[in-house]
């Protein structure tokens, strides 16, 4: 059976939107009125992991490019990076573990943990116009709970 | 130090099964980011990646297998098993296990391994 | 699947000449490629991960470079215990696929 998708955007609990900076990173910040266009559009997978009521395993995906969120080492530490796919074979139930993220709700809000490195949450600064990041910090200085707006395909 | 044996090969007939075991010292599969993977050598032949393992129990498997392998873990003896259903001549190879840490991956350790013989 | 083809096959050097084996991907892989070495009757050996990065306890005259699709190995200079099959291995997508060797002989 195919992957199950849907197109979503993400708002930080600060009501920042997720943009791109530059070919292979996103940036956060608040956007009104047209610049909302700006904010980059999510293809979420419903992708194989371990499932409870709260916490769904998901790949983040951007909508019609070959781009996806993946978690891996780099300088011995989690990082958060866009990685580049070849578009015939992806999305895929069967993703490589450094694409999955735990999706956790909790009180309407979402985190997104990464399923490679436990703990490890797609993250904003309090600053704005940042990289989202992956941070190691829960209830810290950083922001790691979303709000999800679905969008029509 | 890291250790890892492989035990279970043997001569077996096609269309038999063989379970393999992988035990290991020396780090724990309890530990986030590791994985124990196994790799099959056929007699003068290159390497085939057969199966893999993480610590949270996420399973992947080559296609080619076509669903006749299964891999496990007992995290409690240290142990990873191959079981290995159907076998086929084509079968026949050197299995050993390997360990390596988070995706992408590398394989750091590897075991001796073990042969296993599909013949009638 | 990823096809992974290694050159050459067999490669004849003498002790203390530079050689260079070369992996190449059916598609591009980033920098998620290791190599192994392997003696006969032994189980492989890490030597670079992350097509650069030399493994713990691997001496510094082997080196690795590329990105994308293609990918070397380099010994700078030959030593009598280099003889032996080398592979690369993909790591971007599985199935994860490894090259077919490439034996080095001593000339």
């Known amino acids: 059976a195919p992957v199950r998708s849907l197109n979503c955007t993400l708002r930080d609990s600060q009501q920042k939107s997720l943009v791109m900076s530059g070919p292979y990173e996103l940036k956060a910040l608040h956007l009104q009125g047209q610049d909302m266009e700006q904010q980059v559009v999510f293809s979420m997978s419903f992708v194989q992991g371990e499932e409870s009521n709260d916490k769904i395993p998901v790949a983040l995906g951007l909508k019609e490019k070959n781009l996806y969120l993946s978690c891996v080492l780099k300088d011995d530490k989690p990082t958060l990076q866009l990685e580049s796919v070849d578009p015939k074979n992806y999305p895929k139930k069967k993703m490589e573990k450094r694409f999955v993220f735990n999706k956790i709700e909790i009180n309407n809000k979402l985190e997104f943990e990464s399923a490679q490195f436990p703990n490890w949450y797609i993250s904003t600064s309090q600053a704005e116009n940042m990289p989202v990041f992956l941070g190691g910090t829960k209830g810290g200085q950083d922001i790691t709970d979303f709000t999800m707006q679905f969008v029509s395909s | 130090e890291v250790q890892l044996v492989e035990s279970g090969g043997g001569l077996v007939q096609p269309g038999g099964s063989l379970r393999l075991s992988c035990a290991f010292s020396g780090f724990s599969l309890s530990t986030s980011g590791m994985g124990v993977g196994w790799i099959r050598q056929a007699p003068g032949k290159g390497l085939e990646w057969v199966s893999h393992i993480w610590w949270d129990g996420d399973e992947s498997y080559n296609p080619s297998l076509k669903g006749r392998f299964t891999i496990s873990k007992d995290t409690s003896r240290n142990t990873v098993y191959l079981q290995m259903n159907s076998l086929r001549a084509e079968d026949t190879a050197v299995y050993f296990c390997?360990?390596?840490?988070?995706?992408?991956?590398?394989?750091?350790?590897w075991g001796q391994g073990t042969l296993v013989t599909v013949s009638s | 699947d990823i096809q992974m083809t290694q050159s050459p096959s067999t490669l004849s050097a003498s002790v203390g000449d530079r050689v260079t084996i070369t992996c190449r991907a059916s598609q591009d892989i980033s920098n998620y490629l290791s190599w192994y070495q392997q003696k006969p009757g032994k189980a492989p050996k890490l030597l670079i991960y992350?097509?650069?990065k030399l493994h713990s306890g691997v001496p510094s005259r082997f080196s690795g470079s590329g990105s994308g699709a293609e990918f070397t190995l380099t010994i700078s200079s030959l030593q009598p215990e280099d003889f032996a099959t080398y592979f690369c291995l993909q790591g971007k997508m599985l199935p994860w696929t490894f090259g077919q060797g490439t034996k080095l002989e001593i000339k």
């Open positions: 390997a360990r390596n840490r988070y995706d992408p991956p590398w394989f750091v350790d």
């Open positions: 992350y097509t650069s």
